[in-house]
Interface confidence: low
């Protein structure tokens, strides 16, 4: 799978979709995870509804949401309030018994907010409590990465 | 409607390949998984694995993995498996067999199967 | 993987009896969509498996109502109300929750 990058603003939403061919999917549900490291497992951060027949309604986990077309074969996420720490590689799936496909790879890239003026030293630390606007869909801007880009840099 | 028919009886010395096919017609080749099942004299079955000729993604059964390649050809409507290094283990029917196409909860029996291609390994 | 256990080894049967095959899978095969995907074949002498049940209880396009199929999470029976000399061969179970996909060992129903 080539991996494709959706970048967003930090503090706005980022829409993410991965098209699949819904004749081979037909029932079943889907996720969408994270990557942990290169070659580690894909930890699942929102996967859909229970009931596939109702896979259109928008389940959420966090700021997180998740809705499946399954007649046009597009699984959309929604990241709500993108912060920094949300940068990196993900999954959709399509799962199937114990198992899952990979629809998509996708690298999430979050760029700085031009109207924040806040030091670009400072951190912003999961888990502290902040209030944030509704999830409106925002235009995502998606390329390919090319060959031989890495998604992940080298560790030292 | 639906027909899957494979290639003839093969006798092969040890150690060498084969390319089994199964010529598919009568429905969306492309858009309806192709299984590979192994059946030995007088025994069960066994799911080697399948392939979705769309776009060529395949399973494997693990013990099958290192020397079953399964491949698929749209523009001819046919399926292939391959099998290397092949033992006396190997001598077998093998069938292809087509899952039931997908519809609501109706996914993943296999519904129409090849008349099977008997293949005999000995030197 | 999920093993499928499949009893009696041979069911010898007369004409017209009612026949009932067991098969037990090592684990649920309730799919996540709620499904369950366990299917019964046939497969007579020198030829293909058949599809004769899908999905637990489903019968095949063609297949008498003589079939039936029953049973949830991981016990399975199938039964054939008035056995004819055309329904002896093997019967298999398979259930396709997970990959790989697995078979019970075989059923073969003859004749007493």
């Known amino acids: 799978h080539n991996t494709t990058v959706f970048q967003g603003v930090a503090g706005q939403s980022l829409q993410v979709s991965c098209p699949y061919d819904s004749m081979k999917h037909w029932g079943r549900r889907k996720a969408w995870c994270r990557q942990l490291g290169e070659k580690g497992p894909c930890q699942r951060v929102v996967s859909t509804h229970n009931l596939w027949l109702l896979s259109f309604l928008r389940a959420w986990n966090g700021s997180t949401a998740i809705t499946d077309d399954t007649l046009g074969g597009t699984l959309t996420i929604t990241l709500r309030n993108l912060q920094p720490h949300d940068a990196g590689l993900y999954q959709c799936q399509s799962l199937h018994g114990s198992e899952a496909d990979t629809l998509r790879k996708v690298l999430v890239e979050v760029l700085a907010d031009p109207l924040d003026h806040r030091d670009a030293g400072d951190l912003w630390f999961p888990g502290e409590s902040e209030s944030f606007e509704d999830a409106h869909v925002e235009h995502s801007i998606s390329r390919s990465l090319l060959e031989g880009e890495i998604p992940f840099p080298p560790t030292s | 409607q639906v027909q899957l028919q494979q290639s003839g009886p093969e006798l092969v010395k040890p150690g060498a390949s084969l390319k089994i096919s199964c010529k598919a017609s009568?429905?969306?080749?492309?858009?309806?998984?192709m299984n590979w099942v192994k059946q030995r004299p007088g025994k069960g079955l066994e799911w080697i694995g399948r392939?979705?000729?769309?776009?060529?993604?395949?399973n494997y059964n693990g013990e099958f993995r290192v020397r079953a390649t399964l491949t698929a050809d749209t523009s001819s409507t046919t399926a292939y498996m391959q099998l290397s290094s092949l033992t006396s283990e190997d001598s077998a029917v093998y069938f292809c067999?087509?899952?039931?196409?997908?519809?609501?909860?109706?996914?993943?029996?296999?519904?129409?199967w090849g008349q099977g291609a008997s293949v005999t390994v000995s030197s | 993987d999920v093993v499928m256990t499949q009893t009696p080894l041979s069911l010898p049967v007369s004409l017209g009896d009612q026949a009932s095959i067991s098969c037990r899978s090592s684990?649920?095969?309730?799919?996540?969509?709620?499904?369950?995907?366990l299917h019964w074949y046939l497969q007579k002498p020198g030829q293909s498996p058949k599809l004769l049940i899908y999905k637990v209880s489903n019968r095949f396009s063609g297949v008498p109502d003589r079939f039936s199929g029953s049973g949830s999470g991981t016990d399975f029976t199938l039964k054939i109300s008035r056995v004819e000399a055309d329904d002896l061969g093997v019967y298999f179970c398979s259930q396709s929750t997970r990959v790989p996909y697995t078979f019970g060992g075989g059923t073969k129903l003859e004749i007493k």
């Open positions: 067999a087509r899952l039931l196409r997908n519809q609501p909860g109706e996914s993943y029996a296999m519904d129409y």
């Open positions: 009568g429905y969306a080749f492309s858009s309806s998984w």
């Open positions: 684990q649920s095969l309730v799919h996540s969509n709620g499904y369950t995907y």
């Open positions: 392939i979705y000729p769309g776009d060529g993604d395949t």
